[in-house]
Interface confidence: medium
């Protein structure tokens, strides 16, 4: 532990001012584990000027950073990138004339504290007003800053010409789209300071690329997955002031696919179960032996669970004697295909025949027959390549 | 600007084969489903079916599966409808027509290309 | 024969209000999917008029607007003009197995 220094296996603080500390205090290799840190607490230290891009890196888990009352000026752009879990930050007291958001964009701070610094009046620091008002809490900070007088100027008054948030501004706000197709998204970004912008995609599964400069860009996403449905994708506006950022969400449409479709189980009821995916959701039709099964109270089809674009259920069955053994098949069908699957189900012996089994109906199988092509009109069976989703047609959506 | 051309008005026997064409323009062509509608004289619009000029995937109406085939030679940005062997009740205007990716409907058509199937 | 039903004619003076139906059945409008409506004036090709039940493609006039409800979709014309004067038709997913997309029988509307 460093002098002026007491460590414990998750606690760091340095409050003695004698000898004090010059630099960020680290921790000998054969110490405490570094990442074990979650808080570091620095008081009194005169001389600590300085925060570096990998002094603090180390500390991974720590969640609340003091340093107060001592001689902080700098801090570097970088220093709290590998601190994702940083909560509580409290400058209070230091020699910081200037802070950039750039430290602290990428955190989900619940506390930052500035108050006792002399900050310059300038476009850089406008970003801890907004940040200010925009957190409304009656625990508002007292800040100010010196203006080329050396007055102090409470940071609620300041006023910086040609410093303002930017916008962003998205040209698809309905991003509806087809399984294995493209699309290119404009953004438009406006701002004084002229801001930067990026794309955040999140983890978009589709291949994209962009191409972006400084106040337009365009964002262009191939060969779409329909795992990317529901997916939310931003065009982000960035300046010294704060950010700003444009949304839609991304809607896949797809052929069905019968990903699962089994022998009845019985429970309650009996059951035949079967998960279904397809956007917009697909129409369900059984066949019994080749024909159409009318749904009755006694024999129906049920979703238990729908999660998102896949649907899982089973063709429930009351009671099922002798008579309903046989071939069931189901088609799901939607705007942009379909697909079919059999399964030979039994039920029960048919009557005096002792070990239960049907001659006709040995065992239970499972089929995947693929689409049939022609009672619907296809001519290739969709589903069994990428699926490419919907109940209306390829390019349109239709639900 | 987005264009759909089709080929030129056809008279044509019983029993003949045809193929009319559609070409596209001014879009990206295999985003876009390509949907055949039939005009007989003094009727209304039928679907006939589509096509995915991607990857030629169809779809055919039950009424014309089987008397028609769609095809596609996305090189040329070119989609196709033919006749094997034409017959009388044939005779009609045919149209191509564009489905608009992410929003319902036919946004772009064909001029039609009129067939007279007559001996 | 078409699933969608439309009334086979409707006319009306310059600039009076008129209404076109279109009744399909559940395994169509009433299952939930959306109506389109095309313009065909004499002699040309169609001309997507209203998409999704109510949305106008840019270009088309704020007279024509749509509405959708149950198993049934309306175009209604408010200040009828005389280039109106054409034959609409209405559109439809049809998700039955024998289905796949429709256009209603068409009206026609007249001018007086």
């Known amino acids: 532990c460093p002098t002026s220094c007491k460590c414990s296996a998750s606690r760091i603080w340095c409050s003695d001012p004698s000898p004090g500390i010059v630099a960020f205090p680290r921790l000998e290799p054969n110490s405490v584990d570094p990442e074990n840190i979650t808080e570091i607490f620095i008081a009194n230290q005169k001389r600590l000027e300085i925060i570096n891009e990998d002094d603090v890196e180390a500390y991974v888990g720590l969640r609340n950073l003091t340093i107060v009352d001592s001689g902080l000026k700098f801090v570097a752009h970088k220093a709290f990138l590998k601190n994702s879990n940083l909560q509580h930050i409290n400058f209070t007291r230091n020699k910081l004339t200037s802070l950039s958001r750039k430290h602290f964009r990428h955190l989900d701070l619940s506390e930052l504290i500035l108050v006792g610094n002399p900050f310059t009046c300038s476009c850089d620091i406008m970003w801890i007003k907004t940040l200010q008002e925009a957190k409304s809490s009656p625990d508002t900070q007292d800040l100010y800053c010196l203006n080329e007088s050396s007055k102090n100027i409470p940071l609620a008054n300041l006023q910086i010409p040609n410093c303002g948030l930017p916008s962003a501004n998205l040209a698809a706000p309905n991003l509806t789209v087809e399984e294995g197709k493209s699309i290119t998204l404009s953004c438009s970004v406006a701002g004084d300071p002229v801001p930067n912008m990026y794309w955040d995609v999140g983890n978009l599964v589709s291949k994209h690329m962009n191409e972006t400069s400084h106040t337009q860009g365009s964002l262009r996403i191939t060969n779409i997955s329909s795992d990317d449905s529901g997916k939310q994708i931003s065009c982000v506006a960035e300046n010294l002031v704060g950010e700003d950022q444009d949304s839609v969400n991304l809607t896949v449409h797809f052929a069905p696919t019968i990903t699962f479709l089994e022998s009845p189980t019985s429970d309650h009821h009996w059951c035949i179960p079967f998960t279904v995916k397809g956007n917009p959701k697909p129409a369900l039709q059984w066949f019994y032996n080749g024909a159409i099964l009318n749904e009755s109270k006694y024999i129906c089809t049920k979703i238990h669970v729908t999660n998102h674009t896949e649907y899982h259920g089973c063709l429930q069955l009351d009671n099922p004697t002798h008579m309903n053994n046989g071939d069931y098949t189901l088609i799901a069908k939607n705007e942009y295909g379909k697909d079919e699957k059999q399964i030979s189900a039994h039920f029960m012996g048919w009557p005096g025949i002792d070990d239960g089994a049907n001659p006709n109906y040995p065992d239970v199988i499972y089929e995947d027959y693929g689409t049939a092509a022609n009672d619907i009109g296809d001519t290739t069976n969709r589903s069994n390549e990428i699926p490419s989703t919907d109940v209306t047609d390829k390019t349109g959506r239709e639900h | 600007q987005v264009q759909l051309v089709q080929s030129g008005a056809e008279v044509k026997k019983p029993g003949e084969s045809l193929r009319i064409s559609c070409k596209g323009s001014g879009y990206s062509f295999t985003n876009n489903w390509i949907n055949w509608v039939r005009q007989m004289p003094g009727k209304g619009l039928e679907w006939m079916g589509r096509i995915d000029p991607d990857d030629s995937y169809t779809n055919y109406s039950p009424s014309f599966q089987g008397h028609v085939i769609f095809s596609a030679d996305k090189s040329s940005n070119t989609v196709y409808l033919q006749w094997s062997s034409l017959e009388a009740s044939d005779t009609a205007m045919y149209y191509c027509a564009r489905r608009a990716q992410g929003g319902g409907g036919y946004d772009y058509w064909g001029q039609g290309t009129l067939v007279t199937v007559s001996s | 024969q078409s699933v969608l039903t439309q009334p086979p004619s409707v006319s009306g003076a310059p600039g009076q209000r008129v209404t076109i139906s279109c009744t399909g059945s559940s395994s169509n409008i009433g299952a939930g999917f959306n109506v389109h409506w095309y313009q065909q004036v004499a002699g040309l090709a169609p001309k997507l008029l209203i998409h999704d039940n109510i949305n106008r493609p840019s270009g088309v006039p704020d007279r024509f607007s749509g509405s959708k409800s149950g198993a049934s979709a309306s175009l209604t014309i408010t200040g009828l003009q005389a280039e109106d004067e054409a034959d609409y038709y209405c559109?439809?997913?049809?998700?039955?197995?024998?289905?796949?997309?429709?256009f209603g029988t068409g009206t026609k509307v007249t001018v007086l």
């Open positions: 559109q439809s997913y049809d998700s039955s197995l024998s289905g796949w997309f429709a």
